[in-house]
Structures are given as C-alpha cells and as structure tokens.
C-alpha cells in the first residue's frame, strides 16, 4: 500500500504570532517504519536549509539559527520512551513561534520510511500582518485647486492593504506606500482629493480598507471639513410689499464654515430706509414706504472671506389680493 504525506499547500501565520505547519504520513500501515522526519527550507541558503529533524531515539533537533530551536517545536511527535515503545512520528506537525518575515517561504516535510523509502510534501508559509487603520478629515480652505481633504492610513500591513473610497462627490484618490516600522510590513496612505468647496463641507465619505487578515472590509466614515466664505441668499420677500405694510422681514440665509462673524445690510441706491432696522441676519421693516423700491444687499463675513446676496423689492400702492397672504419673513 502506498503512503503519502498530507500537508496544506499554503498556511498563513500572523507576524509575531505562532503558526502550525501540519504534516501527517497517511495511511497508517502495519510494519511501515518511520526512521526519521525532517523539515527543510529548499529555497534557503545552504546553511539554513535544514530546519528541524525528529529522530526516534534522539528526539527533536533544530540545527539552523533561523528559525532556531527557541522558536520551533514538534507539536505531536513523540520520542520512544526507553527502548520498549516505538516512536510516534506519523504526525510531524511543526510549530513556529514569534513569526518573522524571514520565515516566509516553502517548507518541505519529509518522512524517511522503511521499506517504502522517502516521501515528502511541501507547504508554503505566508506571513501576514494585520494592519491598523485610521481615517481623518484634513481641515482645508476653499480653493480652485485639487486638495487633499481626507486621509486614510492602513499601518504596517503585510501584504499591503487595499484602500478605496465610497463617495458621491467628484473626487480622486492618490496613494503612497512606505515601509512600516516592523520589517516587511507596508503602510498605505490614501489621499481623498477634490476641489474644496462649500458643497463638500460636512459631507461624510467612507474609507474602505481590504486585507486578507480581515473577515470583512473595514469601513471608516470621515466627515469632511472645508473652510469656505459665506454662501448667502435672502428670503422673506413675497412680491406683495405695499405702502404702509408693517409685518415685512428679510432674512439673510447663510451657509459657511466657520460661522459668520458679521452681517451688513445695505441698498444699491445708497439710501437706507429709516423704518428698516438690521438685527443681525434679519432686516425688520416697521412700515413700508416708497424708499423700499430698491435692491437690498446682505453682506456676510467670516474668517475666510465674504459673501453677498441681493433682493429687488417692488413696492405696490395697494395689496395684491390675487396672490397668497403676506409672509412676513
């Protein structure tokens, strides 16, 4: 009956962690004697190829300084106790502790048997490192040029993490990769870039990080912060301002980041009706008169700049009853 070596084609281990490389001789055959078990690294330099051996009488040996006896152990293989029992070598599973990047590669598990001869199996050990992820908004100011408004960083992954962004904005990503502080790892930085405008401020975008060590992608929301000058509009005019009306109000509506620091009401004619009183973002009209036949301007300032809006007012002699009732702002 033929025997075979059962190994996994690929085993993954976490950097710094412990991994087991399974190796079994199958099937159990009466009279098949396993005289030696060895683990080798065929792709390593000559003096590092022999990783471990298990001799039925001598037990385990770990000759190579890499990985070295302090980091290697046979999981199940048992030495013969005295000379009365046979060594149990059918399970030659090898454990590697404190995994390093240098441990990655091909490992050959070999059983020297009698009378079948030598049989072997090969496993590829991949050393992976789970990256640490963070994402943050960059405080930027309104500009005409593309600017990085958010960063997503996946630190010290192996292999490098894949970063993408989920957003409805008009954007592009710029990625850089640098070596991590842990040997063999990579830190990936993705820059979410757009032309920063008020439309992007407060919008939440999502950084998506994919890595084979994750069961599912990491999704990190980031709320953008764009400093921009006030975007102003005026509300409250209902096209039914008539002489003597007393309940009219204009409101200066603003979107800005940061908050407005000042409101200024004026008219294009230069004449400001005395019955109009500016109260911050509101202009309260005590009584409409003919001087209101003008264009009102609201100018708003913040730390970034200023914005303005105009509202043309037409004063009627009598109320317009055809339309809806007055809305006094």
């Amino acid at each position: 009956q033929d025997v075979r070596v059962q190994v996994l084609p690929e085993v993954r281990g976490q950097l710094g962690g412990t991994v087991e490389l399974p190796c079994h001789l199958l099937p159990p055959v009466p009279g098949l004697y396993i005289s030696l078990v060895t683990w080798q690294r065929p792709d390593a330099p000559a003096n590092h190829q022999n990783v471990a051996a298990f001799h039925p009488k001598m037990g385990p040996s770990f000759p190579s300084p890499k990985p070295g006896s302090e980091r290697l152990s046979f999981v199940s293989a048992k030495q013969s106790t005295g000379q009365d029992t046979e060594a149990e070598l059918q399970d030659a599973t090898l454990a590697l502790h404190g995994l390093t990047v240098e441990d990655e590669g091909n490992y050959t598990c070999e059983f020297a048997t009698f009378p079948k001869g030598s049989v072997r199996g090969m496993t590829w050990l991949r050393v992976i490192a789970k990256p640490k992820n963070q994402a943050e908004a960059q405080k930027v100011t309104f500009s005409q040029d593309p600017t990085t408004v958010a960063l997503c960083i996946s630190k010290e992954g192996r292999p490098p993490a894949r970063i993408s962004w989920l957003s409805s904005l008009d954007w592009e990503a710029k990625e850089t990769q640098v070596s991590g502080t842990l040997a063999g790892t990579v830190t990936v930085t993705s820059r979410f870039t757009l032309v920063p405008s008020g439309r992007a401020d407060g919008v939440t975008v999502t950084c998506k990080v994919e890595h084979e060590s994750f069961e599912e992608p990491a999704l990190i929301p980031v709320t953008l912060s764009v400093r921009y000058p006030p975007e102003v509009s005026i509300s409250g005019y209902d096209d039914n301002w008539y002489l003597g009306r007393t309940d009219a109000t204009l409101s200066c509506d603003v979107r800005s980041n940061p908050e407005p620091t000042g409101y200024d009401w004026s008219t294009t004619s230069g004449t400001f009706p005395t019955s109009a009183v500016a109260q911050g973002s509101q202009l309260v009209i005590h009584a409409v008169d003919s001087l209101f036949n003008t264009t009102f301007v609201c100018t708003v300032t913040n730390a970034v700049g200023m914005g303005r809006a105009e509202q043309v007012i037409f004063v009627r002699e009598t109320p317009n009853t055809a339309g809806a009732g007055a809305t006094g702002g």
Partner: antibody, heavy 116, light 107 residues
Framework: EVQLVQSGAEVKKPGSSVKVSCKAS????????IHWVRQPPGKGLEWIGA????????NYNQKFKARATITAVTSTSTAYMELSSLRSEDTAVYYC?????????WGQGTTVTVSS | DIVMTQSPSFLSASVGDRVSVTCKAS??????VVWYQQRAGQPPKTLIY???YRYSGVPDRFTGSGSGTDFTLTISSLQSEDLAEYFC?????????FGQGTKLEIK
C-alpha cells in the same frame, strides 16, 4: 538495554547453506524491523534485507532475493538469515542490526567463511 | 539501485589536521544520508544522520553537509581515536546502499 546477540562463526563449503541467528532483548521485538548487513573482509557494507517480526513481512535487496531467506520467531525473539548456494565471495561478517532512525544497534557479527 | 561513490578510499593525516570525506549519490537522495564510523573489529556507529545532524555523544569536530547528490563528512581537528573506517549510507530509496568506505590512518 537493547542487545542483539548473534550465533557463532561458521565455515561452509561452496554450494551449501548457512543460517545465522540473532537473539534480541531489551525492547518489543515485534515493533521493529531487524536488518541484515554483511561486510566482506577489507570491503564495504552491503544491505541484504530485513524482517518485520510483527507480521513476518520481509524485504530484500534484489541481489540476494533468490538466495536469502530472512525470518523471525516471536516466541524466542530471534531473527534468522539463511543464505543458500554459497560461494567464496559470500565470505564475510554478517551483522543483524536494528533500525532506530539509523542502524543504531548491531549484533557482534558472525563470520561466515566459504571455502572448499 | 542508488550507487554511493565515496572518496578517497584511503586517507592519511596527522593529529590536528582537518580532513574531509565525500560521497556522491548516483541520483538525488535529498538529505537522507548517514555517516558511520567503524573501528577495527567492531560494528559501525552512527556519527551523522540526515546529512548534517550530529548524533548523540558524537564530538562536535565531526560535521556533515550536503544535499541532493553531494555529501561531505569533515573532521575539523583529527584526533588519534578517529583512526577508523568511515562509510556513508543512503536511506532515501530501498534498497539501502553504502559507500565503499574510507580508511583513515593517523600519520
């Protein structure tokens, strides 16, 4: 302590047979193959074959298959190697040996001289 | 059968010398090679197994190296008690085969 004790020296005529014994002690006889290796005077080592006392399975070097018979008697923990149709070039020291990783335990050797 | 060609057949060296014995297999045997020492009138004793692993109790002046088809036994500093014959053996494939031996003489 593992011991393999072989039978004494033999002088044989060409064409005859010789049967060498190897009595084992100090371990479970049925769990290990017993191998036979010979060494002609001033020459190298040559593997003849082996027997597994657990099920009397045997395995031979093709060169000796027609002339060698290797057996084991579990009741006495003794292995035997019989070589027939002897010729002068069969003159050698014959060893029984136990494979524990390598040929780790050896009998003291039995000198077989084939001479007319 | 795999042929193990050992050289030299005879070696004469002085105490303290570094000496090497080589063994060439007729086909790839991986690292499945043993080196034995046989003193006059005694059965062989294991020195090295799996090409480079030193057996229990063997002085560290004995080292083995090689894989595939080429193997070397090195004695780094020859001692008078090393007077013996040395054999390589492959156990990769049945039948086991031995080298023809190297007789080491102390000058």
């Amino acid at each position: 302590e593992v011991q393999l004790v072989q039978s004494g020296a033999e002088v044989k005529k060409p064409g005859s047979s010789v049967k060498v014994s190897c009595k084992a002690s100090g371990y479970i006889f049925t769990s290990y193959w017993i191998h036979w290796v010979r060494q002609p005077p001033g020459k190298g080592l040559e593997w003849i074959g082996a027997v597994y006392p657990g099920n009397s399975d045997s395995n031979y070097n093709q060169k000796f298959k027609a002339r060698a018979t290797i057996t084991a008697v579990t009741s006495t923990s003794t292995a035997y190697m019989e070589l027939s149709s002897l010729r002068s070039e069969d003159t050698a020291v014959y060893y029984c040996t136990k494979l524990v990783g390598t040929f780790d335990y050896w009998g003291q050797g039995t000198t077989v001289t084939v001479s007319s | 059968d795999i042929v193990m060609t050992q050289s030299p057949s005879f070696l004469s060296a002085s105490v303290g010398d570094r000496v090497s014995v080589t063994c060439k297999a007729s086909q790839n045997v991986g690292i499945n090679v043993v080196w034995y020492q046989q003193r006059a009138g005694q059965p062989p004793k294991t020195l090295i197994y799996s090409a480079s692993y030193r057996y229990s109790g063997v002085p560290d002046r004995f080292t083995g190296s090689g894989s595939g088809t080429d193997f070397t036994l090195t004695i780094s500093s020859l001692q008078s008690e090393d007077l013996a014959e040395y054999f390589c053996q492959q156990y990769n494939t049945n039948p086991f085969t031995f080298g023809q031996g190297t007789k080491l003489e102390i000058k």
